[in-house]
């Protein structure tokens, strides 16, 4: 059994979680991972999903209940969604960083927009993806 | 040309955003997107720039003078990276408009936690793609 | 501020039952989330249990779950920790501790400390 599972039950208890009532309302993230199957589509939801939860644990880091539940859940999710790669966890960490609000930031992020939005659509890259885009739009 | 290249010089001058200074100190995505080559680690990245433009775009809404520019550019930004798919671009906006700090929204997360994790690599979801992964570590 | 002074410590023999007391003062602890963590020789701090500030809700390691209950007083300004089938591998310094938030954010108030021994 993966460590993150015991963890996991951990924070359930933690946080009353197992309680029917939970589910009351739909799903925040499973019933959004159902939606999409192209592995593409996948990693844009599940980021938003990982830098979530990144998000949540530093919120609790300091809590002394529950610090050793977070930390070995936090590295159990470097370990899977970014297959141990430092590299990869640090570039992410990076862009979550950012301060959405601080005028060098907006001047930057406009400055390199351009050039951002030539890279978001795949076809950008081949001509083969283009051309199989067009004929499965959506 | 594109709809959002005039817009995005629009954005750029509304910020002073041309000016030479602006490259000090290295890039916020561009540096970023360079490193990461593979479709699937692409995503992940430009999952967090995407949502980063949208929080900005949504700060400088009510701002007449580039009311015009924001809609043109998150509008292509639609078209480009969710490929024009409504749904995928609802899904991923409600990802990104869950509050870290409800207790209730807490709750689901953590009642969520394990399957969510479970999911995480693609390992998860196929034998051939298990194998690729111990072959290209990283 | 608040200062919190534990006592009911002792020597007791495995199997047996002890109940500490952590006695608050400086402030009343009705909106504390208040918790106890234990030091073994050796060993780093580990968390023991907490109740919330509703009295009701209660959160133990898995290591004490079962066997120990964590209840509060707030009219006596006074948290127990009621210790039932003790082990040898229970034996440590207890620790009580107060946090301003029954969720998230750290125990920033601490006693000294009761020495708990477990005999086999």
């Known amino acids: 059994q993966d460590p993150y599972v015991k963890e996991a039950e951990n924070l359930k208890k933690y946080f009353n979680a197992g309680h029917s009532d939970v589910a009351d309302n739909g799903t925040l993230f499973l019933g959004i991972l159902k939606n999409w199957k192209e592995e593409s589509d996948r990693k844009i939801m599940q980021s938003q999903i990982v830098s979530f939860y990144f998000k949540l644990f530093k919120n609790f880091k300091d809590d002394q209940s529950i610090q050793k539940s977070v930390e070995t859940i936090k590295e159990d999710m470097n370990v899977k969604f970014f297959n141990s790669n430092k590299k990869k966890r640090d570039d992410f960490e990076k862009l979550t960083n950012y301060s959405v609000t601080d005028l060098n930031v907006q001047r930057k992020a406009i400055h390199e927009l351009i050039q951002v939005m030539a890279e978001l659509s795949p076809a950008a890259k081949t001509g083969k993806r283009k051309r199989s885009q067009m004929l499965f739009r959506g | 040309q594109d709809p959002y290249v005039k817009e995005a010089e629009n954005l750029k001058k509304y910020f002073n955003a041309g000016h030479s200074d602006v490259a000090d100190n290295g890039t916020l995505f561009l540096g970023i997107l360079k490193n990461w080559k593979e479709e699937s680690d692409r995503k992940i990245m430009q999952s967090q720039i995407v949502s980063f433009y949208f929080k900005l775009f949504k700060n400088f809404k009510d701002d007449q003078s580039i009311q015009k520019s924001v809609e043109t550019i998150k509008e292509d930004m639609n078209v480009k990276f969710f490929n024009s798919n409504k749904k995928k671009r609802d899904d991923f906006e409600k990802l990104t408009n869950y509050s870290v700090t409800d207790l209730n929204v807490q709750r689901k997360a953590i009642h969520e936690l394990i399957q969510v994790m479970a999911e995480l690599s693609p390992a998860a979801k196929t034998g051939k793609r298990k194998r690729s992964q111990m072959l290209f570590r990283g | 501020q608040v200062q919190l002074v534990e006592s009911g410590g002792g020597l007791v023999q495995a199997g047996g039952s002890l109940r500490l007391s952590c006695a608050a003062s400086?402030?009343?602890?009705?909106?504390?989330?208040m918790g106890w963590f234990r030091r073994a020789p050796g060993e780093e701090r580990e968390f023991v249990a907490f109740?919330?500030?509703?009295?009701?809700?209660?959160y133990y390691a898995d290591s004490v779950e079962g066997r120990f209950t964590i209840t509060r007083d707030n009219a006596k300004n006074t948290v127990y920790l009621r210790m039932d089938s003790l082990k040898p591998e229970d034996t440590a310094v207890y620790y009580c501790?107060?946090?301003?938030?029954?969720?998230?954010?750290?125990?920033?108030?601490w006693g000294q400390g009761t020495q708990v021994t477990v005999s086999s």
């Open positions: 501790a107060a946090a301003t938030r029954d969720y998230g954010g750290s125990f920033d108030y």
């Open positions: 109740v919330r500030s509703n009295g009701t809700s209660t």
């Open positions: 400086g402030r009343t602890i009705s909106s504390f989330r």
